[in-house]
């Protein structure tokens, strides 16, 4: 009786279980009662990443420099090319099909995590005692100046965007 299901790394065709092609190879001929499945390696610019019965290999992803992309890892016959973004840019999606500039943290916010090729800058509000007066993709919130350590007094209170202003103590 012909099979209705096949083992792992096999597929059913013409009431017969044929071996799948190994990763990195495509199908050129199905098996028959007398012959095994025939496969052929993918060419240099192509890949197949699973045991398969595909008659065509997939093209490697192209990391388009016009979109700010560069190769992070070159593809093989079994793996796709992995793209990342040039310095100062990060991917717009997990599949990294295009890049955008890292965002800057506005005054009052500091950099919690510097951006990478695949993730944007993460900003955080400057807590009490800290400030940021610049728009930056690198600068963290900085602590207010300690007037006391300079034998000075606070003349103007700091905010999340400004440092304190220190001045001399009044002589009485």
């Amino acid at each position: 009786e012909p099979p209705t299901a096949c083992r792992e790394k096999q597929y059913l065709i013409n009431s017969q279980c044929c071996s799948l092609c190994q990763p990195g190879q495509k199908l050129v001929s199905d098996c028959t009662e007398f012959t095994e499945t025939e496969c052929l390696p993918c060419s240099e610019s192509e890949f197949l990443d699973t045991w398969n019965r595909e008659t065509r290999c997939h093209q490697h992803k192209y990391c388009d420099p016009n979109l700010g992309l560069q190769v992070q890892q070159k593809g093989t016959s079994e793996t796709d090319t992995i793209c990342t973004c040039e310095e100062g840019l990060h991917c717009t999606s997990e599949s990294c099909e295009s890049c955008v500039p890292h965002r800057s943290c506005l005054p009052g916010f500091g950099v919690k995590q510097i951006a990478t090729g695949v993730s944007d800058t993460i900003c955080e509000p400057c807590p009490v005692g800290f400030f940021s007066n610049v728009s930056s993709a690198f600068e963290k919130c900085r602590p207010w100046t300690s007037c006391e350590t300079k034998d000075l007094v606070v003349q103007q209170a700091g905010t999340n965007k400004t440092d304190v202003v220190c001045g001399p103590q009044d002589r009485q």
Epitope: Q22, G24, S29, T35, P41, C42, S43
Partner: antibody, heavy 121, light 113 residues
Framework: QVQLQESGPGLVKPSETLSLTCTVS????????LHWIRQPPGKGLEWIGV???????DYNPSLKSRVTISKDTSKNQVSLKLSSVTAADTAVYYC???????????????WGQGTLVTVSS | DIVMTQSPDSLAVSLGERATINCKSS????????????LAWYQQKPGQPPKLLIY???TRESGVPDRFSGSGSGTDFTLTISSLQAEDVAVYYC?????????FGQGTKLEIK
């Protein structure tokens, strides 16, 4: 035993279509693929294309727009057609049996004697 | 396409001596999943069709004398005839069977010195 025999006109005029037939015996075209290869006089080997045992074809991109390979399994024959020929297509044309060694490995294990085709007016 | 380049173009070796033919491919013929190299060698004697000697770089076709051996990996390959016989005079071709279009080297003519 395995045998392959190429046949067809030895002289073809420029711009016409070259037509050759490979007749095989000792194996079935449903079990083995068949390649066409050519060799210009005094030169090296150039792979033209293959018809796999399942019937699908692969061609050399340099000839793809001009070449067609087909088969008639009941007659044990494979045909090669090459259109719009020029003097550069003058060569000995061979057919060869494909052997599959597993793991995606293919080679040409039996060859016909070849037939010389001259393109000239 | 994968370009195959053989060296030397011609070679003269004394009977009983070792003959070595080199073949270089423009890209790797090593399949990373199964670690096999997809290279074949053919012998063509004058007035005859080519004859398959070796496939998968080093596997001799049945009936081929064991004086013929193949080696190499990636892009660099060698055919060695350990002790040249008179009947080995021929042109030798390497061929990549990695993927279509299958391509041949330009051939190396082997003669007796």
């Amino acid at each position: 035993q395995v045998q392959l025999q190429e046949s067809g006109p030895g002289l073809v005029k420029p711009s016409e279509t070259l037509s050759l037939t490979c007749t095989v015996s000792g194996f079935s075209l449903t079990t083995y693929g068949l390649h066409w290869i050519r060799q210009p006089p005094g030169k090296g080997l150039e792979w033209i294309g293959v018809i796999w045992r399942g019937g699908n074809t692969d061609y050399n991109p340099s000839l793809k727009s001009r070449v067609t390979i087909s088969k008639d399994t009941s007659k044990n024959q494979v045909s090669l057609k090459l259109s719009s020929v020029t003097a550069a297509d003058t060569a000995v044309y061979y057919c060869a049996k494909n052997s599959y060694y597993g793991q995606g490995g293919h080679a040409m294990d039996y060859w016909g004697q070849g037939t010389l085709v001259t393109v000239s007016s | 396409d994968i370009v195959m380049t053989q060296s030397p173009d011609s070679l003269a070796v004394s009977l009983g001596e070792r003959a070595t033919i080199n073949c270089k491919s423009s890209q790797s013929l090593l399949h990373s999943f199964n670690q096999k190299n997809y290279l074949a060698w053919y012998q063509q004697k004058p007035g005859q069709p080519p004859k398959l000697l070796i496939y998968f770089t080093s596997t001799r076709e049945s009936g081929v004398p064991d004086r013929f051996s193949g080696s190499g990996s990636g892009t660099d390959f060698t055919l060695t005839i350990s002790s040249l016989q008179a009947e080995d005079v021929a042109v030798y071709y390497c061929q990549q069977h990695y993927t279509t279009p299958f391509t041949f080297g330009q051939g190396t003519k082997l003669e007796i010195k």
